[in-house]
Interface confidence: medium
């Protein structure tokens, strides 16, 4: 089938990085500057993504692949393929409608993005607080006082930080 297709359609022979130029008897022409084709048999090349504003170029555009953007320092990516950038806050803060605000008592954020989350309630697991929580760090739970005997073991690490859902704009 592929061979038949290529006999019928000369465009199918054009490799990635080229396009099938109808204006030039369907010969394979290289993609013009600032454009690319990532698959063969294309009749046009796609315009390269530009990384402007608070975006910066993570990977330059080539004739066969699009540019990739990430965010300038002080911002982090949101959405598939970094479709938008959102302002960073400090650890111990969250981004609100009035800008970066410190986490309320009893909550923490150990990242520069996302929301403040409540400290782990050690007593729910029958444990005691070994290390107090801060705005930047969760509490560290230890064994309950009854468990404290020679050879009694280890500290329970805090639950892994939940990554907030990122959505495109």
């Amino acid at each position: 089938f592929e061979r038949t297709r290529s006999l019928q359609d000369p465009c199918s022979n054009c490799p990635a990085g080229t396009f099938c130029d109808n204006n030039r008897n369907q010969i394979c022409s290289p993609c013009p500057p600032n454009s690319f084709s990532s698959a063969g048999g294309q009749r046009t090349c796609d315009i390269c993504r530009q990384c402007k504003g608070v975006f910066r170029t993570r990977k330059e555009c080539s004739s066969t692949s699009n540019a990739e953007c990430d965010c300038t320092p002080g911002f982090h990516c949101l959405g598939a393929g970094c479709s938008m950038c959102e302002q960073d806050c400090k650890q111990g803060q969250e981004l609100t409608k009035k800008g970066c605000k410190d986490c309320c008592f009893g909550t923490f954020n150990d990242q520069k993005r996302g929301i403040c989350r409540p400290w782990t309630n050690c007593s729910l697991d029958g444990k005691s607080v070994l290390v107090n929580g801060t705005k930047e760090r969760d509490v560290v739970c230890g064994p309950s006082p009854a468990d404290l005997s020679p050879g009694a073991s280890s500290v329970t690490p805090p639950a892994p930080a939940r990554e907030p859902g990122h959505s495109p704009q």
């Epitope: 402007k52 504003g53 965010c71 479709s83 959102e86 302002q87 609100t96 907030p164 959505s167 704009q169």
Partner: antibody, heavy 118, light 107 residues
Framework: QVQLVESGGGLVQPGGSLRLSCAAS????????MHWVRQAPGKGLEWVSV????????YYADSVKGRFTISRDNSKNTLYLQMNSLRAEDTAVYYC???????????WGQGTLVTVSS | DIELTQPPSVSVAPGQTARISCSGD??????VSWYQQKPGQAPVLVIY???ERPSGIPERFSGSNSGNTATLTISGTQAEDEADYYC??????????FGGGTKLTVL
């Protein structure tokens, strides 16, 4: 196909409140930041507010900060704009929109008219 | 936020080229979109990312953006192109800024 339908507009007195709704369909609502944009009669477009897909982050134009609250109910595919302490200058057609971001399309509702007058 | 300035009105004869400008400090470093709005209707995106055309928008619409000015060009203007046009700039972050709008009259 993508559809955005606003409702809740009407006549309200200065200082009053109103809640606008925007019913979304044709796309995965919770995946998208959603905006409100308004247009006063005979005037230009003014960006008002935006909310993240999860609803955890919200942003406002200075002109409405502290008076308007944007929210969403992803289980109902609905966007809201709670407008308090309304002023005559808030009179406008309010559009709910999914505005262009890299790789994303641009869709607007048909708008709902809010009139603030005594 | 950047402030965007558009001429209030532009007139063009049918078949001629209309150019609508949008000026703002270093606007060339940001993404510019253009919207067409006809009376009683919602805005329609005609150009995004400075010069990209959404599907369904005629080829006569094109855009450019550098320095302090972005330009929407309509080649071979038709009567149906008579509308208000708004530029919008976006730096990749959250909020958006619109220009004041330009009324395009096809003579």
């Amino acid at each position: 196909q993508v559809q955005l339908v606003e409702s809740g507009g009407g006549l309200v007195q200065p200082g009053g409140s109103l809640r606008l709704s925007c019913a979304a369909s044709g796309f995965t609502f919770s995946d998208y930041y959603m905006h409100w944009v308004r247009q006063a009669p005979g005037k230009g477009l003014e960006w008002v507010s935006v909310i993240s897909g999860s609803g955890s982050n919200t942003y406002y134009a200075d002109s409405v900060k502290g008076r308007f609250t944007i929210s969403r109910d992803n289980s109902k595919n609905t966007l809201y704009l709670q407008m308090n302490s309304l002023r005559a200058e808030d009179t406008a057609v309010y559009y709910c929109a999914r505005l262009y971001a890299q790789f994303e399309g641009d869709f607007w509702g048909q708008g709902t008219l809010v009139t603030v007058s005594s | 936020d950047i402030e965007l300035t558009q001429p209030p009105s532009v007139s063009v004869a049918p078949g001629q080229t209309a150019r609508i400008s949008c000026s703002g400090d270093n606007i060339g470093s940001k993404y510019v979109s253009w919207y067409q709005q006809k009376p009683g209707q919602a805005p329609v995106l005609v150009i995004y990312s400075d010069s990209e055309r959404p599907s369904g928008i005629p080829e006569r619409f094109s855009g450019s953006n550098s320095g302090n000015t972005a330009t929407l060009t309509i080649s071979g203007t038709q009567a149906e192109d008579e509308a208000d046009y708004y530029c919008q700039s976006w730096d990749g972050s959250i909020s958006r800024v619109f220009g004041g709008g330009t009324k395009l009259t096809v003579l």
